[in-house]
């Protein structure tokens, strides 16, 4: 990657981070009456998430994420869940590249939507701070 492509990657990661934080803030909103129900849904967590290729694991969970977000009141988000997830999907596909043979491996234990989002927020922050 060139310095310009790395800069583009950094910007994409920052957009991904903001989108994930917006979702987390939306579902954690004290006015969200569906939070208790949303927390009953389980998400698969990556066995490891340190590099861009590990975004394969996030991509595979975007559909379940959209389905859970559809439970929330739409006013908690600036965009409809379908549009929000579509935006994330575009970023993820660009970031992880076209290495189609890379298969995700998941951790043994599942997580709530809050734990899931926090994991990918941590991932985004760490890549932003270490990508050179």
């Amino acid at each position: 990657p060139t310095s310009s492509s790395t800069k583009k990657t950094q910007l994409q990661l920052e957009h991904l981070l903001l989108d994930l934080q917006m979702i987390l803030n939306g579902i954690n909103n004290y006015k969200n009456p569906k939070l208790t129900r949303m927390l009953t849904f389980k998400f698969y967590m990556p066995k490891k998430a340190t590099e861009l290729k590990h975004l394969q694991c996030l991509e595979e969970e975007l559909k379940p994420l959209e389905e859970v977000l559809n439970l929330a009141q739409s006013k908690n988000f600036h965009l409809r869940p379908r549009d929000l997830i579509s935006n994330i999907n575009v970023i993820v596909l660009e970031l992880k590249g076209s290495e189609t043979t890379f298969m995700c491996e998941y951790a043994d234990e599942t997580a709530t939507i809050v734990e899931f989002l926090n994991r990918w927020i941590t991932f985004s922050q760490s890549i932003i701070s270490t990508l050179t």
Epitope: K48, E105, T130
Partner: antibody, heavy 117, light 107 residues
């Protein structure tokens, strides 16, 4: 059998440069993330840099802007270009393979870098 | 950055002892922890990954446990070749970080 062999270490003056190499064999080199880890005399281990299979590079604040990790998949080789060296960079530098889903599973024997005037 | 703390720098032990080396992470790292053995003048050797899984060829007397922030490497019956320094490492996020190491010394 997986093998990692480092070379290129030596004595260099503060402010100087050095290029370390790591020759890999026994695995599909291009499919793995590779890392450099260093160990100062009598101290613990410190992660220095990593490069993934797409050649994206990662490093901590301590070396960013001074050290550059790169790879040549055709030669099954990993490199660490070290510039603006300081006394505190004195260490044994290890090349390690980062398994896709687990820890650093194979390590080279190390090469010694001494920064001193 | 995540700080990995091995509170015991040295442990005085004897052959045949059951030894537990502990490591604490400054934040939740799930089970993304590896353990390494290093003997003087040698490079680190990977023992454990995912907190509790032994690498191929690692003797069964070595075991790992823990998740979240607290991790333990246990040697069920210490052998003469086990006197070495042991490091934990988190690979939950970059930058990877290591514990300061625990050196097993002969009592």
């Amino acid at each position: 059998e997986v093998q990692l062999v480092e070379s290129g270490g030596g004595l260099v003056q503060p402010g100087g440069s050095l290029r370390l190499s790591c020759a890999a064999s026994g695995f599909t080199f291009s499919s793995y993330t590779l890392a450099w880890v260093r160990q100062a005399p009598g101290k613990g281990l410190e992660w220095v840099a990593a490069i993934d299979s797409s050649s994206y590079t990662y490093s901590p604040d301590t070396v960013r802007g001074r050290f550059t990790i790169s790879r040549d998949n055709a030669k099954n080789s990993l490199y660490l270009q070290m510039n603006s060296l300081r006394a505190e960079d004195t260490a044994v530098y290890y090349c390690a393979r980062d398994s896709n889903w687990d820890a650093l599973d194979y390590w080279g024997q190390g090469t010694t870098v001494t920064v001193s005037s | 950055d995540i700080v990995m703390t091995q509170s015991q720098k040295f442990m005085s032990t004897s052959v045949g002892d059951r030894v537990s080396v502990t490591c604490k992470a400054s934040q939740n790292v799930g089970t993304n922890v590896g353990w390494y053995q290093q003997k003087p003048g040698q490079s680190p050797k990977a023992l454990i990954y995912s907190a509790s899984f032994r690498y191929s060829g690692v003797p069964s007397r070595f075991s790992g446990s823990g998740s979240g922030t607290d991790f333990t490497l246990t040697i069920s019956s210490l052998q003469p070749e086990d006197f070495a320094t042991y490091y934990c490492q988190q690979y939950y996020t970059y930058p990877y970080t290591f514990g300061g190491g625990t050196k097993l010394e002969i009592k």
